[in-house]
């Protein structure tokens, strides 16, 4: 499973769960819940530490009769870090044992680096839109945890579905768009 | 099929205000996004503003202070308002459609204002 | 602050295949979308890819769009070019969900 492996294709559907409007003026982030994924691919590129994967994704967001005409582009981080302090370690047979002894107690994971706000705009079958705020990623990195660190890296499958957010000023034009946020 | 007409003053004096109007015809401003874009004589594009498709505008941060746009539906048109002309506000402006984000791209293009800032 | 870099201008010979580049200064570009636009002296601008790589109705396949991770930037391929596609080209994206624009590349057929 190289970093240099051939593309392939990924995308998957988010269902964004509505919640209690508000008068913000701007799109808020969302806090917690879950979303729903189909059709995955996925493509490679090589620019973090050594098993630690940036693969590319896209997702349609769908919410109920709205949803986006293109999809959303952001990264996943997978794979298993092997930083290259510890590749010789690895590597070399007779260190084997060294390398697992240490992994023992410690372990380097592919997680989040580097996080962007982003806008996307579903069109509903009436002819409405609707408006969400949504955190993509866009790099990973590799991060060391202690072996009771419990901590589990952010990725598109804990990521958290819309919050809607009316804006006040829609409501007084009585417009049928809305807006949303989601992380 | 899709259009996108700018109209307005071709000449505008120093310190006055620019008002412009954007006629779109074959499609919904409730389903696209309508920027306004400009373009100094030999130079690149500048995006000045959006009126999205909900109604929500946003401005380019270094235009934000002298310029508001808004929009009719019931007539099908966009109008752009600019305060305090100075003669770099000498500019061809163009009203374009935007697709819905992301993506996004800027599908339609009208022909473009030419507007001159002098006395 | 997200910036698109366009090299000023480029030469090219007549059926010849040239690949003008638009860089981004930050992230990861195969998360964002690149569009690209030609235009004519005094006329309006027209698009001739968008989403990264794809072609709007009319426009030549000769003309293809492309994505580098490697160096972070789009690329504009015209295969066989001809003397109309003498013009400037611009790229385009949005950080967040405000456009940005590269600085143009004015294409010289020779």
């Known amino acids: 499973f190289k970093n240099d492996a051939t593309e392939i294709l990924y995308s998957h559907v988010v269902k964004p769960v509505p919640a209690h409007p508000s008068s913000n003026s701007t799109l808020n982030q969302a806090r917690n819940g879950g979303r729903h994924f189909s059709n995955t691919g996925l493509d490679r590129n090589t620019r973090v530490q050594v098993g630690c994967r940036e693969l590319r994704s896209t997702k349609y967001i769908s919410d109920g009769q709205c949803t986006s005409i293109s999809p959303l582009k952001e990264l996943v981080c997978a794979g298993e870090c092997l930083p290259l302090p510890v590749l010789p370690n690895w590597i070399g047979g007779g260190y084997g044992t060294k390398y697992w002894s240490r992994r023992s107690s410690q372990e380097w994971r592919c997680v989040n680096d580097k996080t962007r706000t982003q806008r996307i705009q579903l069109q509903c079958q009436d002819g409405s839109t609707r408006t969400y705020k949504i955190t993509v990623v866009t790099a990973c990195k590799c991060k060391r945890y202690t072996r009771q660190h419990n901590e589990s890296s952010h990725n598109f499958e804990s990521m958290s579905p819309a919050k809607p957010v009316q804006h006040h000023r829609e409501r007084k034009r009585a417009s049928k768009s809305s807006k949303h946020s989601m992380s | 099929q899709v259009q996108l007409m700018e109209s307005g003053p071709g000449l505008v004096q120093p310190s006055e205000t620019l008002s412009l109007t954007c006629t779109v015809s074959?499609?919904?401003?409730?389903?696209?996004?309508v920027h306004w874009v400009r373009q100094p004589p030999g130079k690149g594009l500048e995006w000045m503003g959006v009126?999205?498709?909900?109604?929500?505008?946003d401005y380019n941060s270094a235009l934000k202070s002298r310029l508001s746009i808004r929009r009719d539906t019931s007539k099908n048109q966009v109008f752009l308002k600019m305060n305090s002309l100075q003669s770099e506000d000498t500019n061809t402006y163009y009203c374009?459609?935007?697709?819905?984000?992301?993506?996004?791209?800027?599908?339609?293009w009208g022909q473009g204002v030419m507007v001159t800032v002098s006395s | 602050q997200v910036m698109l870099t366009q090299p000023k201008s480029v030469s090219t010979s007549l059926e010849s295949t040239v690949k003008l580049s638009c860089k981004l200064n930050?992230?990861?570009?195969?998360?964002?979308?690149i569009h690209w636009y030609q235009q004519h002296e005094g006329r309006s601008p027209t698009t001739m890819i968008y989403?990264?790589?794809?072609?709007p109705d009319g426009v030549p396949d000769r003309f293809s769009g492309s994505i580098d991770s490697s160096s972070n930037s789009a690329f504009l391929t015209i295969n066989n070019v001809q003397t109309e596609d003498e013009a400037i080209y611009f790229c385009?994206?949005?950080?967040?969900?405000?456009?940005?624009f590269g600085g143009g590349t004015k294409l010289t057929v020779l």
């Open positions: 374009v459609r935007g697709g819905l984000l992301p993506g996004g791209y800027f599908d339609y």
């Open positions: 074959g499609f919904s401003l409730t389903s696209y996004n």
């Open positions: 009126l999205w498709s909900d109604g929500d505008t």
């Open positions: 930050s992230d990861n570009i195969g998360t964002y979308y």
């Open positions: 989403g990264d790589d794809k072609r």
């Open positions: 385009h994206s949005y950080d967040d969900h405000i456009p940005i």
